[in-house]
Interface confidence: low
């Protein structure tokens, strides 16, 4: 089951999945000057058994002035630029989730992709909040997000985390400013149970990861 | 990546309704983008009418239009409209359909720039007469 729309925003943060459901779809999208190569996939799908999961169909750019040149699908080691990153604010972060069975990993990147990827997520998916460069994390509980079915419907749970200027006095609870707060998405729906289709995801952190897992644009 | 086609303009009488609608084309999935309706009358600025999230969930509108404009999307259709309702002479002006690339890193519930679209219809003229 797709999620009826995307994670919630939080001012001056992005958020990123460790891992992705068995059912995510990642659009094969191609930066400005390529295009898909006709015969190729509109997306990549995350499937699987219970042992192991993997992306399923490549994604293929070719040139857009160029009718049957296909571009590899892999860069080359020399090829593969390093991408961009958010500097963290901290070196906390949440465990590896790229061996949790029905997951798959981040896909590697293509030749010629575009700079940003597109994701439709399912239930039960998970993200993790982190503030930007020049914010910091004012915690009132977990900073992620996770897509669940209540009354037959999807939603994201609210992440509890602020994100403050170093130099502004800090906010507390009640004094946030929502921004772009949707309408009638209420965070405590106690009247039906809410369930989710996967276990609950390991929320302990781990201080070893060398780069920061929330990637904002493929170079 | 994705083509926009308006439809559904025309002249109304004030207090009627119109029903405005975009088709989008292109080899790409609907659903990666979020639509906007934005108006431009003659001598004027391109401004925001409303957008709606590229799932529908979320939907946003101006203040001149609260309440009598409603935007929808049907991305069996690949389709996104604007019912008017109890139109007004100053509703006059072409209406512009715009979709934006939804980003996996970065999200936000509401754009109303006009910059913060990438892609364009050509318009279709509504005249509200008074």
């Known amino acids: 089951e797709l999620c009826d729309d995307d994670p919630p925003e939080i001012p001056h943060a992005t958020f990123k999945a460790m891992a992705y459901k068995e059912g995510t779809m990642l659009n094969c999208e191609c930066k400005r000057g390529f295009r898909r190569i006709k015969s190729g996939s509109l997306y990549m799908l995350c499937t699987g058994n219970s042992s192991h999961s993997s992306w399923d169909n490549q994604c293929q750019c070719t040139s857009s002035a160029t009718r049957n040149t296909t571009k590899q699908v892999t860069p080359q080691p020399e090829e593969q630029k390093e991408r961009k990153t958010t500097e963290m604010q901290s070196p906390m972060q949440p465990v590896d989730q790229a061996s949790l069975p029905g997951h798959c990993r981040e896909p590697p990147p293509w030749e010629n992709e575009a700079t940003e990827r597109i994701y439709h997520f399912v239930v039960g998916q998970m993200v993790y909040y982190q503030c930007v460069q020049g914010y910091r994390a004012l915690h009132r509980g977990p900073a992620e997000s996770v897509c669940k079915m209540t009354h037959g419907k999807t939603r994201w749970t609210q992440p509890q985390l602020i994100c403050t200027g170093e130099m502004e006095t800090s906010q507390f609870p009640g004094e946030e400013k929502p921004q772009a707060s949707p309408e009638g998405r209420p965070e405590s729906e106690t009247s039906c149970l809410v369930t989710t289709t996967d276990f609950q995801i390991q929320t302990e952190m781990a201080a070893t990861m060398e780069t920061s897992i929330f990637t904002t644009e493929y170079q | 990546q994705v083509q926009l086609v308006e439809s559904g303009g025309g002249l109304a009488q004030a207090g009627a309704s119109l029903r405005l609608s975009c088709a989008a084309s292109g080899r790409t999935l609907y659903s990666s983008y979020g639509m906007a309706w934005f108006r431009q009358a003659p001598g004027k600025e391109r401004d925001f009418v409303g957008s709606i999230s590229r799932y529908g969930t979320y939907t946003s509108y101006a203040d001149s239009v609260k309440g009598r404009f409603t935007i929808s999307r049907d991305n069996a259709k690949s389709t996104v409209y604007l019912q008017m309702n109890n139109t007004k002479p100053e509703d006059t002006a072409v209406y512009y359909c715009?979709?934006?690339?939804?980003?996996?890193?970065?999200?936000?519930?509401?754009?109303?720039?006009?910059?913060?679209?990438?892609?364009w219809g050509q318009g279709t003229q509504v005249t509200v007469s008074s």
């Open positions: 715009a979709a934006y690339t939804y980003s996996g890193s970065f999200y936000s519930t509401v754009k109303t720039h006009r910059d913060e679209y990438q892609y």
